[in-house]
Interface confidence: low
């Protein structure tokens, strides 16, 4: 029986409990003076629960508490006794669920050393569900006297939550180390106690794939269940307006935070959390025609497209060759430049340079094709938007965390202890870009233009098929020696107007005279996903011209010429490390396939925890 | 055998990441240069690797990361007899060959010598005093000699610093990854994203199977002040969290 | 960020046990290779080596101290201890923390280094 | 145990010029081809700073204009140009050998 309000929670014992428990507590009734007083209480799932035993109406001076279940020796396992503050506290997890029974005795020692039971007391904890305090305590309980609760999101508004992952089991603590660790926490999360969840994995589902951003903690591996620390950020927010997490981002990476909490820090998410609805009563739902509304053609036209922030490690960035809105300049950061989003235009083959920073960027521009670079993880140098070849006057890593509107930092400053500073609140327009120092996702979105009725391939009432038109020039894509690279074919390259966009045509890439690019080339081209991908070599520096054909269900096809210009390896021999490694096999049947050289760098990738295989340079493959 | 060179593109160039460099390192490799089952698994089956060597070069060039020379312990009270160390430059079979065999040789040649020259001191002391009987149980209860070639070094004891996992054991698993690892990130997320994001589990089919690293990585024997050459190494206690 | 920061009585008196808390962050000494060791300077004079301890519970002494010396660490709360017995006046200096990392080709230097504790011994 | 001299145990220097410290040891500080000494920058109220390990090569953030060199027994730094902020006492320090052993330390005034 589950009360459909807290204030329900079980008062009336004889009437309420279940069988089991009456023999219980008909027995502690008879034994001792009952004392009513202590009020029932609900816990949540996840939340800290903490009340204070009013000892007063039970023991008086030399007497002796003594706390546990109804008719038990001991607390239920998600309780703790604080004897000197005389307070209950504790954090339950799922599997606690249910009404509690909780007694307060006070004995007073016997002449001959026992025992002699005073007055006892019984009350209940009932402990909800964990998305009973989303609708109950986040958006309409009232707050306990001298709480300060955050305001409270609308209805339908989703709150944005930040979640830190621990690698840690709930279940192998005790309940003063979860309360403990919620303490600890409150130093990052500046949160109260009772603002905080703290719940275990479940499923390994580690990460929220709803999440809009994250960051690392100092752990690489998870070792334990794993548990999600969290706390509410805010209402709807987005990666533009999130408030500063510096004080989380930082300390999660450098280990600082699992120097304070006790233990390592998996990593950290943004996300946006949907409020769970009430339940409601089925009716009969009547199907109704549902209009359709086509996906219109990219325009080639100045726009604003909508902003988005796709940071694959392994697809191209889009840095616009038009002046575009970026944060203020801040001091130098090591690591990765920040993600920034950008309009269509110039597509970069982007270094990335150390930890990516979270931040908030609006921007305008006008939407210009460009040039696609695939993006890979060079640190080296830092690339202009016009310049084939990485400039090498800069060796030291560029410390930059925001576009910058001159040439990198060269700063020598050790990174260990240089820190960014507090993101600034509002972004404020900066020169035009030359530092490309973004990673998204080559794509736009097309506004819809006209509404149709049908979504099929062919032609409405006999009007002939028309040819699909390219719309925006791939132009060229950047690669470097020994350096993994692919590049997603933008979805707004090619429009159809029977069958829409890029991703509804079919792709193939060919070389000069409609030749098929070959199972053994450097280059490969997977037309079911509409990447393309390679590892070139030596040999293979220079300009290369290829073609990307996009036919429609009709068999019409448009083409789009592009270049791939491949690039000496940007370090040089300037790369501080060396790796070598022996296998066993005839090297040649390594160095003669394209595939086998893709799979050892993607596996090289692999071991060192990294899914971005362009942070691998192949230096060499020789017989050993 | 196939020799593959590679570098690591989140390394930044300038001044020299040694620490970074570290840490990758003993991520794929043991001090000795052997590959980590994480390692291993990674690349296995198509790859099968025997051993691995990590240089510093460029802004590291006066550093040797695997195959390490331990440091040698120091002690205020009583140095240790110097042991000539080895050349980093070797390659790590050698380093697996100086570090088991030859020694386990070596202390073999010393027990049999010391037997046969207690043996010799033994029957001089008691010459012709000896029954058939007295001499069958000496023999029975004397210590066995074995002889150098009887040593068995086809395959050299498992190296303590490596955690002992049994073959049934299942390895824990692998955090989200998020990208770069090696070099972390904040990252805003978007859906089409999320696939470079997703936690490597159990349940992910292409995950490779991950066998953790030791939780310590450097060299476990004595820090004084320089290094020294001495084995084996002692594992250490295990991360557990306070 | 590398932090060391030293904490200490300030003032005691001849014979006591100077006790001394070095409190990090940024690092941790669960992590192989990591050490924290500890060296004192009396006003207006050089520095002297004192003791250090590694991750793995390794400590070093310096022999002339010895005997007066007791090194310790708390990984979990990122602290390292140091007690000197039966103290005198000769005592009487700033005591330092600080880190000592090993790599392999570098020399152990002690690259991160605490603001120093100042303490006086006096009757 | 090891001693360190360090040589001059002042030294005065315009603005701009070389200024060159010396550390000898009283035995060899190097091991297996790499020299276990390291220079330490201490300035009045601050503790000393890491400038230069195994003889020569610079920590990170420190500026090029420091530089160190020598092996055995014999130890140089070497600073130029010298600037303002670089008065301070320099100290030799090596690591080859318990107990650590630190140089007396040299002053640097400039003129």
């Known amino acids: 029986h589950w009360p459909s309000e807290p204030s329900e929670a079980v008062r009336d014992w004889e009437n309420q409990l279940e069988a089991s428990m009456h023999s219980v507590l008909s027995d502690l009734h008879e034994a001792v003076p009952t004392v009513v007083g202590i009020p029932d209480g609900t816990a949540v799932v996840g939340r800290s629960f903490r009340v204070t035993i009013p000892t007063d109406l039970i023991a008086s001076s030399g007497d002796i508490i003594k706390v546990s279940a109804a008719g038990k020796e001991a607390l239920p396992s998600w309780l703790h006794w604080d004897s000197q503050s005389h307070t209950l506290e504790g954090l339950p997890l799922d599997t606690d669920k249910g009404v509690h029974y909780i007694s307060v005795s006070a004995t007073r020692l016997g002449a001959n050393g026992s025992h002699i039971p005073q007055t006892s007391s019984v009350f209940s904890i009932e402990v909800y569900p964990e998305d009973h305090s989303e609708l109950q305590s986040v958006r309409t309980a009232s707050p306990d006297p001298g709480e300060v609760v955050s305001s409270a999101c609308a209805a339908d508004e989703p709150v944005t939550v930040l979640t830190v992952i621990l690698d840690a089991d709930l279940t192998k603590m005790t309940p003063k180390q979860r309360i403990d660790l919620l303490h600890r926490m409150r130093s990052f999360s500046e949160v109260e106690l009772h603002n905080m969840k703290l719940v275990p994995v479940v499923n390994n589902r580690l990460f929220d794939m709803s999440a809009f951003m994250a960051g690392p903690g100092n752990a690489k591996k998870v070792v334990e269940n794993g548990a999600l620390l969290s706390w509410k950020l805010g209402c709807s927010l987005n990666q533009n307006s999130v408030p500063d997490i510096h004080g989380v981002e930082a300390p999660a990476r450098e280990g600082a935070m699992s120097a304070q909490l006790g233990y390592p820090v998996v990593g950290w998410h943004i996300a946006n959390k949907k409020p769970p609805l009430p339940k409601r009563v089925r009716r009969q739902i009547h199907a109704t025609p549902t209009p359709v509304t086509a996906i219109g053609p990219p325009t080639t036209a100045i726009q604003e497209p909508p902003s988005r922030i796709v940071p694959t490690p392994t697809s191209p960035a889009i840095a616009p060759p038009t002046e575009t809105m970026a944060p203020p300049v801040r001091d130098p950061v090591p690591g990765k430049p920040t993600v920034t989003i950008r309009t269509r235009g110039a597509i970069i083959q982007t270094p990335t340079l150390g930890p990516i920073q979270p931040t908030r960027v609006s921007e305008a521009g006008t939407t210009v094709p460009g040039q696609i670079r695939p993006t890979m993880t060079i640190p080296g140098y830092v690339e202009p938007t016009a310049v084939a070849t990485p400039p090498t006057t800069t060796t030291k890593k560029p410390r930059v965390s925001t576009p910058k509107p001159a040439t990198p930092s060269t700063d020598s400053t050790t990174t260990t202890t240089r820190r960014p500073t507090k993101k600034p609140r509002t972004p404020r327009p900066v020169p035009r870009v030359t530092t490309k120092v973004s990673i998204t996702r080559l794509e736009t979105a097309s506004p819809p233009t006209r509404i149709r009725t049908t979504t099929s391939g062919v032609p409405r009432g006999g009007e002939p098929n028309q040819r699909p038109e390219l719309k925006n020039h791939i132009d060229r894509v950047d690669a470097w020696v020994g350096t993994y690279f692919e590049v997603k074919i933008p979805s707004d390259t090619f429009y159809d107007h029977e069958d829409t966009t890029t991703d509804k045509l079919k792709l193939t890439l060919k070389l000069r005279e409609q030749q098929l690019v070959g199972e053994k080339s450097w280059v490969q081209f997977n037309s079911n996903s509409q990447l393309m991908y390679g590892l070139p070599d030596s040999s293979h520096v220079g300009k290369h011209e290829y073609f990307m054909h996009a036919t429609d269900k009709g068999g019409l096809s448009a083409v789009d010429a592009f270049e791939i210009h491949v690039h000496r390896r940007p370090q040089g021999d300037r790369a501080p490390a060396r790796f070598k490694a022996k296998f066993v096999g005839d090297p040649a049947l390594v160095l003669n396939d394209i595939h086998k050289k893709i799979a050892l760098v993607k596996k090289l990738a692999f071991a060192f925890g990294d899914r971005n295989c362009s942070t691998i340079t192949l230096q060499n493959i020789t017989r050993g | 055998s196939i020799v593959v060179e590679w570098t690591n593109n989140t390394l930044p160039l300038e001044p020299c990441p040694k620490e970074q460099i570290a840490g990758l390192s003993r991520r794929i490799a043991e001090d000795d240069g052997k590959p980590r089952p994480a390692f291993s698994n990674a690349l296995e089956p198509d790859f099968k690797a025997t051993s691995i060597t990590v240089t510093g070069s460029g802004s590291c060039r006066h550093l040797q990361f695997i195959p390490v020379v331990p440091p040698r312990r120091v002690p205020s009270e009583a140095p240790p007899t110097e042991v000539p160390d080895r050349d980093p430059e070797k390659s790590s079979e050698d380093d697996v060959y100086l570090h088991t065999v030859i020694p386990a040789v070596v202390v073999a040649a010393i027990l049999l010598i010391a037997g046969i020259i207690a043996m010799i001191c033994y029957r001089k002391k008691r010459k012709g005093k000896l029954t058939l009987e007295d001499q069958a149980t000496f023999i029975k209860k004397g210590v066995p000699i074995i002889f150098a070639d009887e040593l068995d070094d086809s395959k050299p004891p498992p190296s303590s610093s490596m955690p002992l996992i049994l073959q049934e054991e299942k390895a824990p698993l692998p955090p989200p990854e998020y990208p770069n690892q090696s070099v972390p990130e904040t990252t805003p997320l978007n859906q089409d994203t999320m696939g470079e994001y997703t936690p490597l589990r159990d349940e992910d089919p292409n995950a490779p199977p991950y066998q953790p690293p030791p939780p310590f990585t450097a060299p476990m024997e004595g820090k004084g002040s320089r290094p020294k050459n001495m084995t084996p190494y002692r594992s250490p206690p295990p991360y557990v969290p306070p | 960020q590398v932090t060391l920061k030293e904490s200490g009585p300030g003032i005691l008196k001849p014979s006591q046990t100077l006790s001394l808390t070095c409190s990090f962050s940024?690092?941790?000494?669960?992590?192989?290779?990591?050490?924290v060791g500890w060296i004192r300077q009396p006003s207006g004079k050089g520095l002297e080596w004192l003791a250090h301890i590694w991750w793995d519970d390794d400590k070093y002494y310096n022999p002339s101290l010895k005997s007066q010396l007791t090194i310790s660490k708390d990984t979990s709360r990122n602290q390292v201890f140091l007690k000197i017995t039966s103290v005198d006046t000769a005592d009487t200096a700033t005591y330092y923390c600080?880190?000592?990392?090993?790599?392999?080709?570098?020399?152990?230097?002690?690259?991160?280094w605490g603001q120093g504790t100042s303490v006086t011994v006096s009757s | 145990d090891i001693v360190l001299t360090q040589s001059p145990t002042s030294l005065a220097v315009s603005l701009g010029q070389r200024a060159t410290f010396s550390c000898k040891a009283s035995q060899s500080v190097d091991y297996d081809g790499d020299s276990y000494m390291n220079w330490y920058q201490q300035k009045p109220g601050q503790p000393p700073k890491l400038l230069i390990y195994a003889a020569s090569n610079l920590d990170s953030g420190i500026p090029a204009r420091f530089s160190g060199s020598g092996s055995g027994t014999d130890f140089t730094l070497n600073i130029h140009p010298v600037e303002e902020e670089d008065a301070a006492t320099y100290y030799c320090?090596?690591?080859?050998?318990?107990?650590?052993?630190f140089g007396a330390g040299t002053k640097l005034e400039l003129k």
């Open positions: 600080a880190r000592r990392a090993y790599y392999y080709g570098s020399s152990y230097p002690m690259d991160y």
């Open positions: 320090q090596q690591s080859n050998e318990d107990p650590l052993t």
């Open positions: 940024g690092f941790s000494l669960s992590t192989s290779g990591m050490g």
